[in-house]
């Protein structure tokens, strides 16, 4: 009778993580008597996957009924494959012996590669906010995929970005891989509603890439523009001075009025108007009783936005422009009165 051969017909197979892998093996003879064993890897460090003779292998089932003597099919099925199962599997025929069974013949091996989906990309931006015209960096990370080939793209509002660097680790063979990419984005005043998207395409995703997003509203700070104006006289001896705070983001804003350098009133922005671009406007005003002043008054609107150093705008209120007698009928009281829109 011809000497037994161990046939592993598949040089390689590829299986998606979570699925089962079937490793095929047939022998050409019933002799010599002895068990079949499956190993991952070769040499002294090889890992026993299945032993026909003994042991508990909860993830392994035999494809054929090994209790039938004329069975020559020793294929196995490994359930719930993970990237850690990747490797070359050998079907090995042993001859019964002591003190150990003797390896008689090995199959050529079947390389199992595991297709594992990348994790959802996580995009993170800078720790601190930045203002328009500045360049900020965004990072994108995805892990646990296999094989190593992967494509990563960056978009800002649907437009593909080109200024980015990507690394896939590790460089050598591994059960699974990670990707890390850093993109540079120039901020504009219109970016409050903008999104940066990291898109990852991999063979396991069947043409439906994974996306991670970052809203630039978390990253951008648009400083306000200030305008202080004197409104027409509202009542005899009273002047309405307004401070328009325009186009700022985020909302956090505190406004202080100063009269000739002295703090008159501090208020926190509350009822804001939102612009189409996502920035906000706010207005504060003062009612100034000019009859209480002999000299010109310098009114300053000072704004502290999002914890940044204050910016201010001043307005000179000319007292001399009013008739001297206008203060004669005014009851004594505060020199400044204020109001803000509800």
């Amino acid at each position: 009778e011809e000497e037994l051969q161990v046939i592993q017909p598949d040089k390689s197979i590829s299986v998606a993580a979570g699925e089962s892998a079937t490793l095929h093996c047939t022998v050409t003879s019933l002799i010599p008597v002895g068990p079949i064993q499956w190993f991952r890897g070769a040499g002294p460090g090889r890992e026993l996957i299945y032993n026909q003779k003994e042991g508990h292998f909860p993830r392994v089932t035999t494809v054929s009924d090994l209790t039938k003597r004329n069975n020559m099919d020793f294929s196995i099925r490994i359930s719930n494959i993970t990237p850690a199962d990747a490797g070359t599997y050998y079907c090995v025929k042993f001859r019964k012996g002591s003190p150990d069974d003797v390896e008689f013949k090995s199959g050529a091996g079947t390389e199992l590669s595991v297709r594992a989906k990348p994790s959802a990309p996580v995009v993170s931006g800078p720790a601190a906010r930045a203002t328009p015209q500045h360049t900020v960096s965004f990072t994108c990370e995805s892990h646990g995929f296999s094989p190593r080939d992967i494509t990563l793209k960056w978009f800002k509002n649907g437009n593909e970005l080109s200024d980015f660097q990507t690394n896939v680790d590790p460089a050598g063979d591994s059960v699974s891989y990670s990707i890390h990419s850093t993109a540079k984005v120039v901020l504009t005043r219109e970016d409050v509603h903008s999104q940066v998207i990291c898109e990852v395409a991999h063979v396991t995703l069947q043409g439906d890439p994974l996306r991670g997003t970052a809203n630039l509203s978390e990253t951008i700070r648009v400083p306000p523009t200030l305008e202080v104006t004197q409104q027409p006289v509202r009542a005899e001896n009273q002047v309405n001075v307004t401070c328009q705070v325009r186009k700022f983001y985020p909302q956090r804003l505190q406004l202080t009025w100063l009269e000739n350098g002295n703090v008159s009133r501090t208020e926190t922005a509350s009822t804001l108007t939102e612009n189409k671009d996502g920035t906000y406007n706010w207005m504060s005003w003062l009612l100034v009783n000019v009859s209480a002043h002999r000299d010109d008054v310098k009114l300053t609107c000072q704004v502290e936005h999002d914890g940044q150093p204050a910016v201010s705008k001043s307005h000179d209120l000319k007292v001399s422009a009013h008739p001297k007698e206008q203060g004669s009928n005014t009851a004594p009281g505060p020199a400044l009165a204020s109001a803000a829109p509800l």
Epitope: K53, E54, R69, S98
Partner: antibody, heavy 118, light 107 residues
């Protein structure tokens, strides 16, 4: 049902011959290593002979040259030709099937009695 | 030839008892050891192969262990039908050899 049925035992004079048969049913005999085991009255079990799937044969020392194991695939039967019989060969002879991959005995026949006496 | 030695040769026990029979090989036999049960006038019945694997239909009260040269058969809770003679056998190499048997009797 997997079954082994022995026949051919009986009384024979020392120096005489006897041919034991074992008819297998429920499985293909040629796919298994097959054995003969004997047991003298009140004694333990003694392995006698085996035939492998490739036709290779094995014997215990005391029967070598006197006993011959064979099989007939068409009849799905195993045989033991016993020549030059001695009083020490008196025993119940069992036909036994070897296990699937390690030749562990799994199926036994009911036995046939061989008595060697003058 | 490989010699197989069983102990004890006979053993008295009661229903419900747990009993252990040992078998020693004269040389390493890996785990190619089988256990058989035989009742008077009957053919032996296969219980265990490769030292610890139960043949189909054998109740789990029977268990085997060991490797190399020392092996044991344990019956966890004796029932009346378990009183019989038990044999061990090595089948790693020809000639296959049996132990002399252990007769388990009712006390």
């Amino acid at each position: 049902e997997v079954q082994l049925v022995e026949s051919g035992g009986g009384l024979v004079q020392p120096g005489g011959s006897l041919r034991l048969s074992c008819a297998a049913s429920g499985f293909t005999l040629s796919s298994y290593d097959m054995h003969w085991v004997r047991q003298a009255t009140g004694k333990g079990l003694e392995w006698v002979s085996a035939i492998g799937t490739a036709g290779d044969t094995y014997y215990t020392g005391s029967v070598k040259g006197r006993f011959t194991i064979s099989r007939e695939n068409a009849k799905n039967s195993l045989y033991l030709q016993m020549n030059s019989l001695r009083a020490g060969d008196t025993a119940v002879y069992y036909c036994v099937r070897g296990g699937v991959w390690d030749d562990a005995f799994d199926i036994w026949g009911q036995g046939t009695m061989v008595t060697v006496s003058s | 030839d490989i010699q197989m030695t069983q102990s004890p040769s006979s053993l008295s026990a009661s229903v419900g008892d747990r009993v252990t029979i040992t078998c020693r090989a004269s040389q390493d036999i890996n785990n190619y050891l089988a256990w058989f049960q035989q009742k008077p006038g009957k053919a032996p019945k296969s219980l265990i192969y490769t030292a610890s694997s139960l043949h189909s239909g054998v109740p789990s009260k029977f268990s085997g262990s060991g490797s190399g040269t020392d092996f044991t058969l344990t019956i966890s809770s004796l029932q009346p039908e378990d009183f019989a003679t038990y044999y061990c056998q090595q089948y790693v190499s020809y000639p296959y050899t049996f132990g002399q048997g252990t007769k388990l009797e009712i006390k």
